[in-house]
């Protein structure tokens, strides 16, 4: 058993039929010695009396909020949560495996630039009795500070018969230099509690590997005289690291017909303009990627040819 | 993804072209190592990230763009021991910091060159003959060092009398290539920045 936070404890259980469970001794946080009674959750049934209560925790029915009282007053309480281990593996029932970029990916993270700010998100099909807490650091043996906000519900989607909920959190490395060469990864730890079930999820990455620029901005077309060609121009996204001559982007320009089956013309350039042939009913799209370190491409910015 | 090949203008900052070739070469070599050594810990997640230049050069600090010198997190250790001049500074008024920056890059390349050559000598003795260093990458390092043109004593290649441990050598190669790729990215950013300024 270990303390997750004040008055909240996690009991780690090997989960198999007829498992013996864990013996837990609860102590009432009070100078009082006599007339103390114990209850579980909001039930008034007295489980025991005295300053300590010994319980055998085997299943979820044994977890919950244990309260010690004296004469109608709450003296203290302890919330017991269960963390299941099945066949030596901690349970991952609360979050959905996103399977990208590989199996067992429960947390996904992205950064728009090298400022040390990043966003992580995760998916669940659970809608109620759900709480998350996020901690992060750079490195684990001598951790350096990363500050994360509260996790918030950021999207709801219908997937077949199920509703899927996306939660996200923003974190910021406390003293980040955009030009630094990372040698220690960022560690992100998410504690998840559903009803009385506790689980934890972790992710480890370098900011450079989770970079995904915002799409190029101010995408414009300028027709060239007496020609089917147009000059496409765009700008670096506002959120990208500066100076741009140091944090350079490379771009992919694509001409796409109305039908997805039509051949796509693609041009790669380091400049912020390109000359392409604009076909009728086609659209021109541009996306960006760090010029020197090949992490993710941005989403496309698009304009119609007409 | 291959980086777009830039053909330098005659007046272009001379080292940009070489640094782009360097990044391309080390990226290709790292990819080759990851494929060839697929049963060795050679991915970014599996290896320890060591920097052989740590405490010996300070390229990131010395080459910091002016705009980032206001960022206190970037100014941990802005002292370096190099002061000299090189041909990449051709016909440009350069600051003391820029000379420090380029000489720091030169020292990095020299250290990696020695390590890679020593390692290659060991790999050539491997009966499995599984992987060798790309001669093109070694040549590109040499070209960029010549373009930087700093006067520096030649460092003798390290020689070792004991029987090489080929497994350890291949792991060390992965560690070295990952670190050198990160440094090559920094060098490319610096050259791009200097070319624009």
């Amino acid at each position: 058993i270990w303390e997750l936070k004040k008055d909240v404890y996690v009991v780690e259980l090997d989960w198999y039929p007829d498992a013996p469970g864990e013996m837990v001794v609860l102590t009432c946080d009070t100078p009082e010695e006599d007339g103390i009674t114990w209850t579980l959750d909001q039930s008034s049934e007295v489980l025991g009396s005295g300053k300590t209560l010994t319980i055998q925790v085997k299943e979820f029915g044994d977890a919950g909020q244990y309260t010690c009282h004296k004469g109608g007053e709450v003296l203290s309480h302890s919330l017991l949560l269960l963390h299941k281990k099945e066949d030596g593996i901690w349970s991952t029932d609360i979050l959905k495996d996103q399977k990208e970029p590989k199996n067992k990916t429960f947390l996904r993270c992205e950064a728009k630039n090298y400022s040390g700010r990043f966003t992580c998100w995760w998916l669940t099909t659970i809608s109620t009795d759900l709480t998350f807490s996020v901690k992060s650091s750079r490195g684990s043996s001598d951790p350096q500070g990363v500050t994360c906000g509260a996790a918030t519900l950021s999207a709801e989607r219908v997937r077949g018969d199920n509703k899927e909920y996306e939660y996200s959190v923003e974190c910021q490395e406390d003293s980040a230099c955009p030009a630094a060469e990372e040698s220690l990864p960022i560690e992100v730890m998410v504690d998840a509690v559903h009803k009385l079930k506790y689980e934890n999820y972790t992710s480890s990455f370098f900011i450079r590997d989770i970079i995904k620029p915002d799409p190029p901005k101010n995408l414009q077309l300028k027709p060239l005289k007496n020609s089917r060609q147009v000059e496409v121009s765009w700008e670096y996204p506002d959120t990208w690291s500066t100076p741009h001559s140091y944090f350079s982007l490379t771009f992919c320009v694509q001409v796409q017909g109305k039908s997805k089956r039509e051949k796509k013309d693609r041009v790669f350039t380091d400049k912020t303009s390109a000359t392409v042939i604009c076909r009728k009913n086609a659209s021109i799209s541009v996306r960006a990627q760090d010029r020197y370190y090949s992490s993710s491409w941005s989403e496309w910015a698009s304009v119609p040819c007409s | 993804r291959n980086l777009p090949v830039a053909t330098p203008d005659p007046g272009m900052f001379p080292c940009l072209h070489h640094s782009q070739n360097l990044l391309r070469a080390v990226s290709n070599m790292l990819q080759k190592a990851r494929q060839t050594l697929e049963f060795y810990p050679c991915t970014s997640e599996e290896i320890d990230h060591e920097d052989i230049t740590k405490d010996k050069t300070s390229t990131v600090e010395a080459c910091l763009p002016l705009e980032l010198t206001k960022n206190e997190s970037c100014l941990n250790s802005r002292e370096t021991s190099f002061i000299t001049n090189g041909s990449c500074l051709a016909s440009r008024k350069t600051s003391f910091m820029m000379a420090l920056c380029l000489s720091s890059i030169y020292e990095d390349l020299k250290m990696y060159q020695v390590e890679f050559k020593t390692m290659n000598a060991k790999l050539l003795m491997d009966p499995k003959r599984q992987i060798f260093l790309d001669q093109n990458m070694l040549a590109v390092i040499d070209e960029l060092m010549q373009a930087l043109n700093f006067n520096s004593e030649t460092v003798p290649q390290k020689s070792s009398l004991e029987e090489p441990d080929f497994y350890k050598t291949k792991i060390k190669l992965c560690i070295l290539l990952h670190a050198f790729r990160i440094r090559a990215v920094t060098i490319d950013r610096v050259m791009s920045y200097l070319n624009a300024s």
């Epitope: 008055d7 909240v8 909001q42 919950g64 007053e73 709450v74 302890s78 109620t128 807490s133 | -």
Partner: nanobody, 114 residues
Framework: QVQLVESGGGLVQPGGSLRLSCAAS????????MSWYRQAPGKEHELVAG??????KYADSVKGRFTISRDNAKKTVYLQMNSLKPEDTAVYYC?????????WGQGTQVTVSS
């Protein structure tokens, strides 16, 4: 998602009364103890009152003046505040008790001033 929405705060003269309400959703309300915390400017959060398994707990500074109650059917917890003093001025938050991570509401401001 756990949601706690406080209301009922306002400006009141010393000696006056207010009743705060907290509407809860996103969790099984009847299974949890509930509490009211407050935070005065520049001070730590302090537990004002809690209700759990039918029993209550009060901070010494509010005993005899404040009363906590709950209505499980309405998923609401209340704080009746009488004989208010200037030192009761703070933002009042409701929370599950014991608190589970950051499940605060946005708070309701109570100002006691003549």
């Amino acid at each position: 998602q756990v949601q706690l929405v406080e209301s009922g705060g306002g400006l009141v003269q010393p000696g006056g009364s207010l009743r705060l309400s907290c509407a809860a959703s996103g969790f099984t309300f009847s299974s949890y103890g509930m509490s009211w915390y407050r935070q005065a400017p520049g001070k730590e959060h302090e537990l004002v009152a809690g209700i759990s398994a039918g029993s209550t707990k009060y901070a010494d500074s509010v005993k005899g003046r404040f009363t906590i109650s709950r209505d499980n059917a309405k998923k609401t917890v209340y704080l009746q505040m009488n004989s208010l003093k200037p030192e009761d001025t703070a933002v009042y938050y409701c929370s599950r008790w014991p608190r589970l991570f950051e499940d605060w509401g946005q708070g309701t401001q109570v100002t006691v001033s003549s």
